[in-house]
């Protein structure tokens, strides 16, 4: 673990001084620190055309430290690197560069994208969604009774949000038209007083939805379903069979 004596030839500057500044153990007027006090790191700083030795508690930005048995030494990282593990492996790049597998790059390779927060090249993350949840009950205006046609919805969750270059999420909500067996509203399910009362026999061509009583008919004239002729009804039946899908939420 000790340094081998045979190959060591320490060339000291003539003006070697023991009365050194700061953490220097030995120094010279011309070269600054030549060696450091225990636990301090020796680094060479370029000042103009000459290099000056300095002693530091840790290596500065752009350098990495090696604790040899006889000296703690700072070694320069590559030019584009701010923090490195050693000469080969950068761990943080200088501004304007992106870190990828220990190297600093101007641009991230194909299939990767730049994370401008960490300044690293990262894998492109595509959106991932869960399976659809079951369809909700068929409802109209929030009620599940007293009508024939309504809408039902289903949702799915986003499992993985996409990164900047990732594929966008598909819709997470789907709504479609639905039909239900005509079901009389129970007392607690009634809408506005007296409006949900069912007529004895709906006329041919009327919808099976609950319709207002005769008094309200006078004021409202006809409800839309009563206005439909037979051709329109046929058209509607075909559309219902196709259960057209409309999308409400996109991420």
């Amino acid at each position: 673990q000790n340094a081998s004596r045979g190959r060591r030839q320490r060339r000291m500057h003539p003006n070697v001084s023991q009365g050194c500044q700061g953490g220097c153990a030995t120094c010279s007027d011309y070269n600054g620190c030549l060696s450091c006090k225990p636990r301090l790191f020796f680094a060479l700083e370029r000042i103009g055309m000459k290099q000056i030795g300095v002693c530091l508690s840790s290596c500065p930005s752009g350098y990495y430290g090696t604790r040899y048995p006889d000296i703690n030494k700072c070694t320069k990282c590559k030019a584009d690197c701010d923090t490195c593990f050693n000469k080969n492996f950068c761990t943080k790049c200088k501004s304007g560069f992106y870190l990828h597998l220990g190297k600093c790059l101007d641009n991230c390779p194909e299939g990767l994208e730049a994370n401008n927060h960490t300044m690293e090249c990262v894998s492109i993350v595509h959106c991932e969604v869960s399976e659809w949840n079951p369809w909700s009950p068929c409802t109209k205006k929030g009620k599940t009774c007293g009508f024939k046609r309504g809408t039902e919805t289903r949702v799915r969750e986003i499992i993985q949000h996409p990164s900047a270059k990732g594929n966008l999420c598909p819709p997470t909500n789907e709504t479609r038209k639905c039909t239900v067996q005509r079901k009389k509203c129970q007392k607690g399910e009634r809408g506005k007083k007296g409006r949900e009362r069912k007529r004895k026999k709906p006329n041919k061509g009327e919808s099976k939805e609950a319709i207002p009583d005769s008094k309200s008919l006078e004021s409202s004239k006809e409800i839309p379903e009563q206005r439909e002729n037979k051709q329109q009804q046929k058209k509607r039946k075909v559309q219902d069979k196709q259960k057209s899908v409309s999308v409400s939420t996109v991420h």
Epitope: T66, P69, F85, K87
Partner: antibody, heavy 116, light 107 residues
Amino acid sequence: EVQLVESGGGVVQPGRSLRLSCAASGFTFSDYDMAWVRQAPGKGLEWVATIIYDGSRAYFGDSVRGRFTISRDNSKNTLYLQMNSLRAEDTAVYYCTAHDRSFDYWGQGTMVTVSS
Amino acid sequence: DIQMTQSPSSLSASVGDRVTITCLVSEDISNDFVWYQQKPGKAPKLLIYAASRLQDGVPSRFSGSGSGTDFTLTISSLQPEDFATYYCQQSYKYPPTFGQGTKLEIK
């Protein structure tokens, strides 16, 4: 492509000497501290010695200090390990490696067997 | 010298398994820590440096974690080519020291 090619291994009697060489290519040899790491048959890895990039300082593991010397010739991109007073326990595969805190590049190894 | 205690010394697992190898260090070494993989008859290969950074060409199923004295190598889903011996090494100070190795075998 980085290449480290060891040579000089073989069978040698206890007390005798052997010199291993390692020819480097594919990287700037003179920028790197170089080391020898060995592995006895069926055992783990053991650091043997390191010489710094310019050859001015060298460091040795306790088990070889005083018997082994490490040297380099940067003009030839070659690393050496001079092994004297060899013992049975020095029997191992000897790997030449670029040592910069971690051992980044490795040779394929050369087998040294110390046996009477 | 800094002591490295690697465990387990051997481990049997199946393809697809998640495997964890640990290394305990006798003093705080921050993240100055490396993992190697060695296959029979071959030289060791550097897998992870600075405790958690993957070397170029190493599959993303390998990951390293830890800082200070406790370090972990995880293989998320073992592949046939991952059966090998794994070594940890501290790069904090001289002399460089290795763990005794973990031999990962097929169950």
